[in-house]
């Protein structure tokens, strides 16, 4: 009796079960009564990543330098190519097809995780007793000048944005 | 049913291409396979390559460099030339559908001589 | 490349004996599947090989009981318990198990 189901690495067809083609290699023929499936490796920049029954392997994706992408690991036949962002740029999604320049944190916002080829600058407020007044993907909010340690006094307020100004302290008559 | 027929010159030169015609009907070349096999006078049998149905090729490994398989499957036709022939590629000349082992072409027989 | 050896090169029987013919391969012909794709063929002169035997053991539509074959691995058998005179031809052994396919040397089946 000609089988429902098949076992794992294998697939119906014609009311017999044929073995799936390896990682790396392509469905040329299914199986017959005088012969196993017939499979062949898939062509150089091509790859499957899968036990298949595939016809056809899949290309390489190609990291495109003009869209800022350069390729993170080379493709094998079994896998396919990672690309990755040139310097300075990070990818727009998952699959990283394009790149996009890494965000600058505006004044009163610092760098909480610098930006890699994958993930973009992720910016945080700075809180009070911070403060960043440049546009920045590197700089972390800096902690306000502590004037008492130089001897000085709070001439004015720092703010996000602002450092705060110190003075000389009052002379006492 | 399946049916297979060689055709093609019966004499060769030496250093010449041998070229051949398998003609199949009843089954489909975009679906299946076509082997080409030969059998020198009086000796046993060599499997000389396939096309399968996508057109990808496999070659036996002692004729590769001079043996070329294609098809054209609205002909239903696929085609044999073997380049540089001698005379030890004299031989009957078969072809056989993939899956039809049961069903072989009546042969052809090529002689290489001047 | 798989080489398949055939023995004995001709075999000199009556008609009503039984035939035993051998193949030998020279590597395993078990497929990682399991299957084992040896076939025997009968070939008579001027004419085109009929297939007989398929995945070592199992007779091809209309050919009579008396041809079985049997074996595993890397020997194989195939086994006419009767020889009919129309049974007195040149016979194959052929492996699809791996590309290159092979074919044995034949071994010759004549009457005595």
């Known amino acids: 009796e000609p089988p429902t189901a098949c076992r794992e690495k294998q697939y119906l067809i014609n009311s017999q079960c044929c073995s799936l083609c390896q990682p790396g290699q392509k469905l040329v023929s299914d199986c017959t009564e005088f012969t196993e499936t017939e499979c062949l490796p898939c062509g150089e920049s091509e790859f499957l990543d899968t036990w298949n029954r595939e016809t056809r392997c899949h290309q390489h994706k190609y990291c495109d330098p003009n869209l800022g992408l350069r390729v993170q690991q080379k493709g094998t036949s079994e896998t396919d190519t990672i690309c990755t962002c040139e310097e300075g740029l990070h990818c727009t999604s998952e699959s990283c097809e394009s790149c996009v320049p890494h965000r600058s944190c505006l004044p009163g916002f610092g760098v909480k995780q610098i930006a890699t080829g994958v993930s973009d600058t992720i910016c945080e407020p700075c809180p009070v007793g911070f403060f960043s007044n440049v546009s920045s993907a590197f700089e972390k909010c800096r902690p306000w000048t502590s004037c008492e340690t130089k001897d000085l006094v709070v001439q004015q307020a720092g703010t996000n944005k602002t450092d705060v100004v110190c003075g000389p302290q009052d002379r006492q008559r | 049913q399946v049916q297979l027929q060689e055709s093609g010159p019966g004499l060769v030169k030496p250093s010449e291409t041998l070229s051949l015609t398998c003609t199949v009907s009843g089954f489909s070349l975009p679906t299946s396979g076509v082997h080409w096999i030969r059998q020198p006078p009086g000796k046993g049998l060599e499997w000389i390559g396939v096309i399968w149905a996508g057109g990808d090729t496999n070659y036996n490994p002692s004729l590769k460099s001079r043996v070329t398989i294609s098809k054209d499957n609205s002909k239903n036709q696929v085609f044999l030339k073997l380049s540089s022939v001698t005379a030890a590629d004299t031989a009957v000349y078969y072809c056989?559908?993939?899956?039809?082992?049961?069903?072989w072409g009546q042969g052809t027989l090529v002689t290489v001589s001047s | 490349e798989i080489v398949l050896t055939q023995s004995p090169g001709t075999l000199s029987l009556s008609p009503g004996e039984r035939a035993t013919l051998s193949c030998r391969s020279s590597q395993s012909l078990v497929h990682s599947s399991g299957n084992t794709y040896l076939q025997w063929y009968q070939q008579k002169p001027g004419q085109a090989p009929r297939l007989l035997i398929y995945k070592v053991s199992n007779r091809f539509s209309g050919i009579p009981d008396r041809f079985s074959g049997s074996g595993s691995g890397t020997d194989f058998t195939l086994t006419i318990s009767r020889l009919e005179p129309e049974d007195f031809a040149v016979y194959y052994c052929?492996?699809?198990?791996?590309?290159?396919?092979?074919f044995g040397q034949g071994t010759k089946v004549e009457i005595k």
């Open positions: 056989l559908g993939h899956g039809h082992f049961d069903v």
């Open positions: 052929s492996q699809t198990t791996h590309v290159p396919w092979t």
